[in-house]
């Protein structure tokens, strides 16, 4: 004969556990129903009656199947340096991430607690390691033969133009100036020259070694959020 399906609440067999989306109530000593995401336990089960669930109130949520007596409060509104990438609903917390041009200096379980503006490299320095969602820009002096004349969190050091006749030699913060109407060859502006140090002056005392691994020149895509712990160990 097929085993009978037990309806909650029920007393589990000795040594067995409650089924999926059920929990063991110590007081009633019964397996009882959990509440679905977006709800919480309004009345706990007894030996004769199952858990009574109720919807979360505004600005509160539960993300998992649970038997918590109160829903969790959604986080505070996003600050001016953040954008709300996930709204507060009955089933999920608000998630705030840093707005463009900022990075997360102090993260929390979901989203960001503290955003900071991305570092801007001053003239003579270029972006050696771009900023990501969670890390700042790293600036390095432009290598000999390259320059940056901007203050920017994205600009890398660019090669000096090559002149037939040089009017003013380039340095780390200025392109070469040619006397002729056009240079013999001007490096494509899109050419990637990550700064291996240079100086803000034109003389250098050492050759520039290549970095062992070239840093990425693009921003990383944001990572997906991870769910917070709740009063439940999952499904």
């Amino acid at each position: 004969l097929p085993a009978q399906v037990a309806f909650t609440p029920y007393a589990p067999e000795p040594g067995s556990t409650c089924r999926l989306r059920e929990y063991y109530d110590q007081t009633a000593q019964m397996c009882c129903s959990k509440c679905s995401p977006g709800q919480h336990a309004k009345v706990f089960c007894t030996k004769t009656s199952d858990t009574v669930c109720d919807s979360c109130e505004d600005s509160t949520y539960t993300q998992l199947w649970n038997w918590v007596p109160e829903c969790l409060s959604c986080g505070s509104r996003c600050s001016s340096d953040q954008v709300e990438t996930q709204a507060c609903t009955r089933e999920q917390n608000r998630i705030c991430t840093c707005r463009p041009g900022w990075y997360c200096a102090l993260s929390k379980q979901e989203g960001c607690r503290l955003c900071a503006p991305l570092r801007k490299c001053r003239p003579g320095f270029g972006v050696a390691r771009p900023g990501t969602e969670t890390s700042d820009v790293v600036c390095k002096p432009c290598a000999p033969g390259t320059f940056s004349n901007t203050t920017s969190s994205t600009d890398i050091c660019r090669p000096h133009q090559i002149c037939n006749v040089v009017a003013i030699p380039g340095n780390a913060s200025m392109d070469a100036v040619c006397t002729s109407t056009s240079p013999t060859r001007s490096m494509a502006p899109g050419a990637v020259h990550l700064p291996q140090p240079v100086s803000t002056r034109s003389q250098h005392t050492q050759p520039t070694p290549e970095p062992s691994t070239a840093p990425s020149t693009s921003f990383l895509l944001p990572m997906g959020p991870s769910p917070p712990a709740e009063g439940s160990t999952g499904d």
Partner: antibody
Framework: QVQLVQSGAEVKKPGASVKVSCKAS????????IHWVRQAPGQGLEWMGW????????DYADKFKKRVTMTADTSISTAFMELSRLRSDDTAVYYC????????????WGQGTLVTVSS | DIQMTQSPSSLSASVGDRVTITCNGS??????LAWFQQKPGKAPKLLIY???SLQTGVPSRFSGSRSGTDFTLTISSLQPEDFATYFC????????FGGGTKLELK
Amino acid sequence: QVQLVQSGAEVKKPGASVKVSCKASGYTFTDYIIHWVRQAPGQGLEWMGWIDPDYGNTDYADKFKKRVTMTADTSISTAFMELSRLRSDDTAVYYCARDEGSPLVMDAWGQGTLVTVSS
Amino acid sequence: DIQMTQSPSSLSASVGDRVTITCNGSQNIDNYLAWFQQKPGKAPKLLIYSTYSLQTGVPSRFSGSRSGTDFTLTISSLQPEDFATYFCFQYNNGYMFGGGTKLELK
């Protein structure tokens, strides 16, 4: 917190060399360049040069080009400044300072190392 | 190299006074000018960078301004702990400190 801790005072004879160290902590050593600045007794501040610990590249003030060598050991997060052919007018306090390459400059300094050059 | 001429070289003032120190660059340095405070036996301390920006933790009585190639550090109301030597520093084209201004108690 960010700290730059320099080696102790030195007394040297004219013609000798001195090597001053600057140990960094509290930040990623290779993400910042290190400047060296000196100050003779009762005088102003004088920029000597910088080193990028990441690649070992340097830039020296013209005045010191022939006598100064700046190096770094990333394994111990330490920058070094060696000045050779010392003269009595090299007697000074030598400072290291970090620089992130943004408009924010030299935001953390070592405590200074007094180098006395005397026969 | 760009030269930085700082004036005055010394200055006597009283607590509560408003004080200004000026630095003039021999060439255009954009806004890449910083101000440092140094007390006897201590390392310099960054007060202002990029002409106007107050370093974290520095009291708001310190401010920086610019008119052409003239840069000014202003202390709006001198406090006892402000008596020290002040240096300007240009970092637009090479690196160069001004000669310093010793601020003494009158």
